[in-house]
């Protein structure tokens, strides 16, 4: 799925958005739409919880072999994150030992600070790929295979439950809309439903701090939506010429 690619990992700048849309264009001609089924989206392999601490650019993590193989290698690549320059003071006790057993680099003792001891699941930039869940089995699938926090109103349309991926797949006519929809989902990650923080050591942070200032208000999300729409419209206009 093209959103798994490195071009779509950081959707915070216009150039990155356009790059992502460009990368995803081949998907539009694919035989199967991104969300097959009778109006009910397939479970995404992208999970909100994969955005672990990606916006804290505080450390560099070495690459690690993944157990995934296959043509498009979803989640195979582990992005290196640039070491931050102006980090705040270390919490008491300093960083815990690195999980990979590697010796700390020359800078690590000072300003570069591993966040791995914050037990948020995966380290910075690390993708997580849960197995898809089909709770209703032989009956019509619900959108439950979607993480609960994905069940949200997006562009005026709530994800429908009950039709499910076992329904007839459409023939790809809605692929452009699906692309826009899924890019918006990836870019917005609106805070509805529980923001899972149960194993973070000091519980839930204030709402406006949850994304490190990246998504403090509803207003700040609007430009992203507009940006996507403009980019796609511009793209279609160029094609028309």
């Amino acid at each position: 799925w093209c959103l798994e690619s490195s071009q779509c990992q950081d959707l915070t700048t216009e150039s990155n958005l356009l790059e992502c849309i460009r990368a995803c264009k081949p998907d539009l001609s694919a035989e199967t739409p991104m969300f097959p089924g009778n109006g009910d989206e397939q479970p995404l392999t992208e999970n909100p919880r994969k955005y672990v601490m990606g916006h804290f650019r505080w450390d560099r993590f070495g690459r690690r072999n993944s157990s995934s193989s296959g043509s498009s290698g979803a989640g195979q690549k582990r992005e290196d994150v640039s070491a931050g320059e102006d980090c705040g003071p270390l919490p008491e006790g300093g960083p815990e030992p690195r999980s990979d057993g590697a010796k700390p680099g020359p800078r690590e003792g000072k300003r570069s600070y591993s966040m791995e001891h914050f037990r948020w699941g995966k380290p910075v930039g690390k993708k997580r790929r849960p197995v898809k869940v089909y709770p209703n089995g032989a009956e019509d699938e619900s959108a439950e295979a979607f993480p609960l926090e994905f069940k949200r109103e997006l562009t005026g349309q709530r994800l429908r439950e009950g039709d499910g991926p076992d329904g007839p797949a459409d023939d790809g006519a809605g692929a452009q809309a699906d692309l826009e929809h899924s890019l918006l989902v990836a870019a917005e990650k609106k805070d509805e439903g529980p923001y899972r923080m149960e194993h973070f050591r000091w519980g839930s942070p204030p709402k406006d701090k949850r994304y490190g200032g990246f998504m403090t208000s509803e207003k700040s999300q609007t430009p992203l939506v507009t940006l996507f729409k403009n980019a796609i419209i511009k793209n279609a206009y160029k094609k028309g010429e």
């Epitope: 043509s71 195979q76 849960p130 898809k132 089909y134």
Partner: antibody
Framework: EVQLVESGGGLVQPGGSLRLSCAAS?????????ICWVRQAPGKGLEWIGC????????YYASSAKGRFTMSRDNSKNTVYLQMNSLRAEDTAVYYC???????WGQGTLVTVSS | DIQMTQSPSTLSASVGDRVTITCQAS??????LAWYQQKPGKAPKLLIY???KLTSGVPSRFSGSGSGTEFTLTISSLQPDDFATYYC????????????FGGGTKVEIK
């Protein structure tokens, strides 16, 4: 009705190979589902072998299955495969395919590795 | 791969008893845990997913709880049909961690 049916099990000699099939009905494999393989040795617990995302073709394996076992799919036949090479006596088990995390499991096919 | 430790391995109980089975993950798996019931010669049946969500058609006497690394399956009042083997399974991350099963708990008649 949504169903999975395994086939291809049987008696094989140590060092031999076998390809198991998992035929899906009631849903279209190419739409992009996780189909997973799980085995159960006689009198033992369940052991996860791996999953294939039938949409992308991406495969994910248990550490113990890497190297000898390969999953693939044929969308035209609505079927997923498990190729098993260099089989050993300890691979003797009932092999199940399952649709992700669900109650949709095949009936299982017995693989016996013995000389 | 993540290790899933299930206990007890065998549990003797009577009809009407409250039964509790625990499952511990070797690292945090959030709520990505499923519970299955298996009877001899049959394929497993999904009871609970997302640690606490009951699959449709499963009696409400079954319940699941927990998150992070500690999980529990509870049968509030054991019925004759519940004598079986129960397995937990994580599905948190198949890229790095696999979808490991616990060792199983056989619930037998006392």
């Amino acid at each position: 009705e949504v169903q999975l049916v395994e086939s291809g099990g049987g008696l094989v000699q140590p060092g031999g190979s076998l390809r198991l099939s998992c035929a899906a009905s009631g849903f279209t494999v190419s739409s992009g589902y996780d189909i997973c393989w799980v085995r159960q040795a006689p009198g033992k617990g369940l052991e996860w072998i791996g999953c294939i995302d039938t949409g992308s073709g991406n495969t994910y394996y248990a550490s113990s299955a890497k190297g000898r076992f390969t999953m693939s799919r044929d969308n035209s036949k609505n079927t997923v495969y498990l190729q098993m090479n260099s089989l050993r006596a300890e691979d003797t088990a009932v092999y199940y395919c399952a649709k992700g995390i669900s109650s949709i499991w095949g009936q299982g096919t017995l693989v016996t590795v013995s000389s | 791969d993540i290790q899933m430790t299930q206990s007890p391995s065998t549990l003797s109980a009577s009809v009407g008893d409250r039964v509790t089975i625990t499952c511990q993950a070797s690292q945090t798996i959030s709520s990505d845990l499923a519970w299955y019931q298996q009877k001899p010669g049959k394929a497993p049946k999904l009871l609970i997913y997302a640690a606490s969500k009951l699959t449709s058609g499963v009696p409400s006497r079954f319940s699941g709880s927990g998150s992070g690394t500690e999980f529990t399956l509870t049968i509030s009042s054991l019925q004759p049909d519940d004598f079986a083997t129960y397995y937990c399974q994580t599905y948190y991350d198949i890229i790095d961690d696999g979808a490991t099963f616990g060792g199983g708990t056989k619930v037998e008649i006392k």
